[in-house]
Interface confidence: low
Amino acid sequence: CEEPPTFEAMELIGKPKPYYEIGERVDYKCKKGYFYIPPLATHTICDRNHTWLPVSDDACYRETCPYIRDPLNGQAVPANGTYEFGYQMHFICNEGYYLIGEEILYCELKGSVAIWSGKPPICEKVLCTPPPKIKNGKHTFSEVEVFEYLDAVTYSCDPAPGPDPFSLIGESTIYCGDNSVWSRAAPECKVVKCRFPVVENGKQISGFGKKFYYKATVMFECDKGFYLDGSDTIVCDSNSTWDPPVPKCLKVLPPSSTKPPALSHSVSTSSTTKSPASSASGPRPTYKPPVSNYPGYPKPEEGILDSLD
């Protein structure tokens, strides 16, 4: 027989010879990092037909690292489902917990023993320090010193000393989040008051009031013979200004001798040619808008509210 077969997990005991006599036996041992589990044979014999009797390295098993339990409030996930050397163990903490230590450990061979590259991490509960205090306001649970994951606090504004109230700007509720950080910045409390919105040749159709505080919403329509230049709905923003700006009602001009451009009967926000009704800026039209069923325009001899689509 020629040289005996070679294997990934086991190696020949002694030096190989160029050839072997019939009946001659060779023995193998498990390589470093592998261990033998009986009963499979780890030897072979040169057979009468000049071939080696079948043998495999199935009896040699890769050294495995010690079993790692799931950390408390977390999970240990073998990266490819095995504890054998050369592979990784990933650690994940359950929601509401964070990892202290290495996120990945490696199963390494030290001498002939497989050991983990480090100490398994632990999962600690996510805790937050008290949320910020705000001027002219307060939050719930102000006496609590430590907050747990997803614990929430709600802010409210103090009564104002003057005639106008403090408005809460931002989200009133925040919660203790993933990285021991509050979910968002604390809101603020301040007086927000927008000027009375006057639209000549038009009128409010919703949001009536004498004073307009934060988030007050007003909707307008134009008198007959006028069209809206700007947005029909405006909101009082945190800077005490209307957003978008207060619209104008512009006079519909008499028809010119030239034919007006055709307007589609369906409104699309992606339309490149905007009608005057949807135009917030740009040159004023010099033609009379058509008096069709185009949304936002009155039909002949009808009030605007009747024709709103």
Epitope: Y67, R69, D70, Q75, A76, V77, A79, N80, G81, T82, H90, I92, E95
Partner: antibody, heavy 116, light 109 residues
């Protein structure tokens, strides 16, 4: 509220494809290993596939290897199971489940019927 | 044929104690992998009952307990109640594969 909402089941012919979805709320799927488990009518549970928390490792049961693909879209917080070359024996209720070694949260399941 | 073997059915009268066995091999339970138990009430999704051999998730009554020894594990239910009637599955792991037992139907007489 922590839950898994499943969609995408239905009746399909052998050899055709189907995609199941599992939308998570109350937690983020990319913090956890996520699994698909199925249950044929009147039978027991059979594990189908898993995707590791980082998405780099995917494992499949031998019965679906090469035909099914597990994936997820972190921006949509959703887990998917793309099922190709479906066979009659794939008929089952498919559950998505959260967790590594064990499944601590399950979807309600979606029925997939493979029939000509 | 499931790799983890469970009895197809067990039964008991209200108030009694029943156990459900789960037998594996040296490549799964015997290799040190944890055993978990799930309860599946009729027409519903499975629910985690015991994890890591003997731990109960919050909300699971202490009438349910788990144990593991060698290549097998068992689930014990004491003070049996009518609402415990369900299918019970054990689960473990082997290289790259999550395993389930064939399931045991518990009947409360």
């Amino acid at each position: 509220q922590v839950q898994l909402v499943q969609s995408g089941g239905g009746v399909v012919q052998p050899g055709r494809s189907l995609r199941l979805a599992c939308a998570a709320s109350g937690f983020t799927v990319n913090n956890y290993a996520m699994h698909w488990v199925r249950q044929a009518p009147g039978k027991g549970l059979e594990w189908v596939a898993v995707i590791s928390y980082d998405g780099n490792n995917k494992y499949y049961a031998d019965s679906v290897k090469g035909r099914f693909t597990i994936s997820r879209d972190n921006s949509k917080n959703t887990l998917y199971l793309q099922m190709n070359s479906l066979r009659a024996e794939d008929t089952a209720v498919y559950y998505c489940a959260k967790g590594g070694g064990y499944f601590d949260l399950w979807g309600r399941g979606t029925l997939v019927t493979v029939s000509s | 044929q499931s790799v983890l073997t469970q009895p197809p059915s067990v039964s008991g009268a209200p108030g009694q104690r029943v156990t459900i066995s789960c037998t594996g091999s040296s490549s799964n339970i015997g290799a040190g992998y944890d055993v978990h138990w799930y309860q599946q009430l009729p027409g519903t999704a499975p629910k985690l009952l015991i994890y890591g051999n003997n731990n109960r998730p919050s909300g699971v009554p202490d009438r349910f307990s788990g144990s593991k020894s060698g290549t097998s594990a068992s689930l014990a239910i004491t003070g049996l109640q009518a609402e415990d009637e369900a299918d019970y599955y054990c689960s473990s792991y082997t290289s790259g594969t999550w395993l389930f037992g064939g399931g045991t139907k518990l009947t409360v007489l």
